[in-house]
Amino acid sequence: LIIGFGISGRHSITVTTVASAGNIGEDGILSCTFEPDIKLSDIVIQWLKEGVLGLVHEFKEGKDELSEQDEMFRGRTAVFADQVIVGNASLRLKNVQLTDAGTYKCYIITSKGKGNANLEYKTGAFSMPEVNVDYNASSETLRCEAPRWFPQPTVVWASQVDQGANFSEVSNTSFELNSENVTMKVVSVLYNVTINNTYSCMIENDIAKATGDIKVTESEIKRRSHLQLLNSKAS
């Protein structure tokens, strides 16, 4: 969480951002809030990016003002206009690119004053893993697959019964480059699994951590997946 305060001149207002991560090819949110102001006509929201000449986005006098927008963001940005008076200056970024990573500034002017806060935005690829029983294998085998990751993650297996056990000797992980030549498909196979146990396949890079669980019993198979973004610090 980054909390910024206004500069000299008129009163300062508090602006708060949250460091976040964007998933390449999908839409992302750069989060920014400020002290609410009912006078929409007086609110100016400017998003800037370090090292970029033009603006990322500008909203003023109740509408988008994109004449100064940098080419790399053309047609890809939007604020939540109907939420501005309650202090929401968050930016929606369409079709996140690897090059969108960097330091952004959310700069706000209202009838009460000015303020700004920085935000670190990471980009990469992350996806939910799915763990299945591999019936084609000669022994009891589990297969963990996740379609899109970048940068290359680590994969670790764990089990409820054998807590703390190292499965690196009985697992094999491969990374296959996807067609767009950036993201990769992750496939990890765990051998010699036992029945009536819960196994977890944990995939992690510096952006996200995802876990796929599978519980195999005589009568049923239960699955559960979970994904969490790392380093979501507010400013």
Epitope: I38, K39, L40, E61, G62, D82, Q83, V86
Partner: antibody, heavy 117, light 107 residues
Framework: EVQLQQSGTVLARPGASVEMSCKTS????????MHWVKQRPGQGLEWIGT????????NYNQKFKGKAKLTAVTSANTAYMDLSSLSNDDSAVYYC??????????WGQGTLVTVSA | DIQMTQSPASQSASLGESVTITCLAS??????LAWYQQKPGKSPQLLIY???SLADGVPSRFSGSASGTKFSFKISSLQAEDFVSYYC?????????FGGGTNLEIK
Amino acid sequence: EVQLQQSGTVLARPGASVEMSCKTSGYTFTGYWMHWVKQRPGQGLEWIGTIFPGNSDTNYNQKFKGKAKLTAVTSANTAYMDLSSLSNDDSAVYYCTMGLRTWLDYWGQGTLVTVSA
Amino acid sequence: DIQMTQSPASQSASLGESVTITCLASQTIGTWLAWYQQKPGKSPQLLIYAATSLADGVPSRFSGSASGTKFSFKISSLQAEDFVSYYCQQFYTTPWTFGGGTNLEIK
């Protein structure tokens, strides 16, 4: 489901003060502006002002400054409006109203204030 | 303050007819305008927001349009329950202001 429940009809003497309430449910009370609107019998709508319960920030129509006072009790999810120095001109229905997306999508049923000697 | 001049103040029409109400803002308000319907003894109800968007659950015979500072509200085929009052309102700047209202009467 968002609901705004206003207090009942008030009969008051000229020069007196009245307080009316607007009890809310179904949304985060502290996160949205609560507005108050006046409607005299057979007349149009007038915006009195608004309060942001999260920080008690207010904005009044100049015409109602000194006449209306807006407050909010976040623990009770309730907004209040005090009207002071009542005169016949203050006889009206008063609405609390709010919008989850700026415009006023939700309205209370109104509180009728009658000022009479 | 921004003045919202609504016309006509009242209008007579027949069932099935179309009617158009206009609101003229005294200065630019973008598309920060809403239209409300009010039935006798009831609270106003949002019909149109952001000048042209239909609120949830509102029949498609209601529509809004915008051209600069002139805003129009149309009911395409009047039903019996439509003969009530209508108001426009700007929420671009404070004080938020309403038009004077239009009372629709059955001919």
